[in-house]
């Protein structure tokens, strides 16, 4: 008899990452009989929702349904109809919603309620929308990259699945940069985690991990820029802010009310004699770097050592995967190569920031001015955060790997979140490897 393909015995899962600047939907797929194996879940689709983050819908919650439609419809197309009802959907909201909740639990609840109602209208198995903690965001990012790198597998392989993967089982640290927060997560070397808030204990695949994590709310790239502007405008003599973090010739008008909308600028808030001010770029990396450093309070540390703002940070250990905006920004600046030293990155940033705005616009005609204008700040901020914030050095810089995808799956917290909620990471090593599903009979 002729060989006939059996229906694929696969499962799907959907996670929406409701970030501060945008929402992305991820679809994951895995063989049903290999749920407890490490590295079998992979991403089959990413859909970026058009528009801002959900926290911006406070004044227009009725538009949330339409906002989510395209990506949810895409999920309907990608996932076979027969699988819809058993496909779990999770939405995790991060720092943008943490900030909205800080201002008002009612407004945050209202946004989430409408999101939940919208997502419940689809034929999937909706599991709820919630604001995840900064600790979860860091932990799940760490789980994601180490799962994808095969670090939890007890089988040592003779081959390497990604260029920067080492064959040893030492886990990678995770560096995540968003618009409103940044997370640092890693396993310190024989170091007591002095602050209980920063300590996590995991048992994964039969191995114990003592993990350090911290999420710096307000230190994502967008909120850091708001902080810097609020700090700098305090000492401006008039409504002109000459800003070294923007290209020479760049001009933009900012409303003071927008500047003080976020809790992140609360410490810099003051009564100004104007309602608006104009940013005028002067494009100077060194001055920009100095201005950014003023956002990191390093004068106070109640522990043996700190990152900044009195937050405990153990000595850095091992290799780190830097993803999300760490990757997007450095990729745009063409600085993700393993061969680019920290000194070279600094040199390139100096040149880039000094380029006139008109020249930059001509060089990147396809990039929207709003995003294009901020790469000088973002690149400088990344350097400042990694070097002065997290204490990487010119030598340890080579241990940072700017990662977009690993094996076709995006680095980020969403995969780790789904693996946890679907109980796909066992505490103990599975006793036997399930027989592989034979596709043909």
């Amino acid at each position: 008899t002729q060989n006939k393909a059996l229906p694929e015995n696969v499962k799907y899962g959907i996670v929406l990452d409701a970030g501060s600047s945008h929402t992305s939907l991820y679809i994951y797929k895995w063989p049903a009989e290999k749920e407890n194996d490490t590295g079998v879940v992979h991403q089959v689709e990413e859909c970026r929702v058009k528009g801002p983050g959900i926290s911006k819908f406070v004044q227009k919650v009725n538009e949330i349904g339409i906002y989510l439609t395209d990506c949810m419809e895409r999920a309907r197309e990608v996932i076979p109809r027969s699988q819809h009802q058993e496909t779990p959907v999770y939405l995790g909201a991060t720092a943008g919603m943490r900030l909205l909740r800080m201002e008002s639990e009612e407004l945050a609840d209202r946004v989430l309620d409408v999101v939940e109602r919208s997502l419940s209208n689809y034929p999937f198995d909706f599991q709820g929308a919630r604001i995840i903690t900064g600790q979860e965001e860091g932990a799940y990012g760490w789980i994601t990259i180490n799962y994808l790198l095969g670090k939890f597998s007890q089988k040592t392989r003779w081959f390497s699945i990604v260029p920067y993967e080492t064959n040893n089982q030492e886990t990678f640290g995770a560096l995540d940069l968003g618009g409103a927060s940044t997370q640092v997560t890693f396993v310190p070397q024989n170091q007591t985690i002095e602050s209980p808030d920063n300590a996590l204990q995991f048992r994964l695949y039969g191995k114990d991990y003592n993990v350090y994590t911290h999420s710096f709310l307000c230190y994502g790239k967008d909120q850091a820029l708001w902080q810097k502007l609020a700090k700098d405008i305090q000492v401006a003599s008039n409504e002109i802010l000459r800003d070294p973090c923007f290209h020479p010739g760049y001009k933009k008008v900012v409303n003071v009310s927008d500047l003080y909308k976020t809790p992140c600028t609360k410490r810099f808030e003051m009564t100004l004699p104007f309602q608006q001010f104009e940013i005028q770029g002067i494009g100077n990396y060194q001055q920009c770097h100095q201005s950014i450093l003023e956002l990191f309070n390093t004068s106070y540390c109640p522990y043996s050592q700190c990152a900044f703002n009195g937050i405990f940070l153990p000595p850095l250990q091992g290799d780190f995967g830097a993803f999300s905006a760490f990757y997007f920004v450095m990729k745009f600046l063409n600085l993700t190569s393993e061969k680019v030293s920290q000194e070279k990155v600094t040199e390139m940033m100096k040149k880039f920031c000094a380029q006139p705005w008109e020249e930059i616009k001509t060089s990147y005609p396809a990039v929207a001015a709003k995003y294009l204008s901020e790469y000088c700040f973002s690149g400088t901020y990344i350097l400042s955060l990694l070097l002065q914030g997290y204490h990487f050095t010119a030598d340890s810089w080579e241990h940072i790997h700017f990662i977009g995808k690993i094996q076709g799956s995006d680095a980020g917290w969403t995969l780790g979140y789904m693996l946890n909620l679907t109980n796909m990471i066992p505490a103990e090593q599975p006793l036997s490897t399930p027989l592989s599903h034979s596709t043909y009979v």
């Epitope: 909740r101 800080m102 307000c218 410490r267």
Partner: antibody, heavy 116, light 111 residues
Framework: EVQLQQSGPELVKPGASVKMSCKAS????????MHWVKQSHGRTLEWIGY????????TFNQKFKGRATLTVNTSSRTAYMELRSLTSEDSAAYYC?????????WGQGTLVTVSA | DIVLTQSPASLAVSLGQRATISCRAS??????????MYWFQQKPGQPPNLLIY???NQGSGVPARFRGSGSGTDFSLNIHPMEADDTAMYFC?????????FGGGTKLEIK
């Protein structure tokens, strides 16, 4: 479980200052604002102001501005309120409460008595 | 400042009956489709306890006999059926704008 533990009662002289504390547990301290509320004669509740533990920024009821100072120590997860130039009118129970706009969790209160 | 006028100042209700407390704001406390109105219960020697948030949502662990309603400037708290344990002071609060303000309180007793 969210808990706010306030410091004990204070007996202070007119013109002096008092500093009370509110130790938080059971949640991420920097994710929520901390408010302070005054209650006199077991009836009148007055909002004093709030602090953003994340960065130390604060907002006050104009009535208390200049006389009240709000601070935090994030490593010990503690919020503080100092009241200066005390008069008999300041004799009251002072509460800390966690929230943005919803005061869902309150400390047990610190009773301040201003007396010569 | 938004002034909250609570009435009555005191109220005595028989067990099993309905208690209604009202709170009127000097201007609307609604914003972005949310009513920033809250109701608290306070017993002697204890801090206030959140009963109702957003005008009509029950706080965590609050019995269903406590109901909040209203929008804009007029709000009410209904307790039905009245139980002995409900003897307490009740306060309304607005957090629409700074300074956040409280009503003068209603003393609820058993008749």
């Amino acid at each position: 479980e969210v808990q706010l533990q306030q410091s004990g009662p204070e007996l202070v002289k007119p013109g002096a200052s008092v500093k009370m504390s509110c130790k938080a547990s059971g949640y991420t301290f920097t994710d929520y604002n901390m408010h302070w509320v005054k209650q006199s004669h077991g009836r009148t509740l007055e909002w004093i102001g709030y602090i953003v533990p994340l960065n130390g920024g604060s907002t006050f009821n104009q009535k208390f501005k200049g006389r009240a100072t709000l601070t935090v120590n994030t490593s010990s997860r503690t919020a503080y309120m100092e009241l200066r130039s005390l008069t008999s009118e300041d004799s009251a129970a002072y509460y800390c409460a966690r929230g943005g706009t919803r005061f869902a969790y309150w400390g047990q209160g610190t009773l301040v008595t201003v007396s010569a | 400042d938004i002034v909250l006028t609570q009435s009555p100042a005191s109220l005595a209700v028989s067990l099993g009956q309905r208690a209604t407390i009202s709170c009127r704001a000097s201007e609307s406390v609604d914003n972005f489709g949310v009513s920033f109105m809250y109701w608290f219960q306070q017993k002697p020697g204890q801090p206030p306890n959140l009963l109702i948030y957003g005008a009509s949502n029950q706080g965590s662990g609050v019995p269903a006999r406590f109901r909040g309603s209203g929008s804009g400037t007029d709000f009410s708290l209904n307790i039905h059926p009245m139980e002995a344990d409900d003897t307490a002071m009740y306060f309304c609060q607005q957090t629409k704008e700074v300074p956040y303000t409280f009503g003068g309180g209603t003393k609820l007793e058993i008749k």
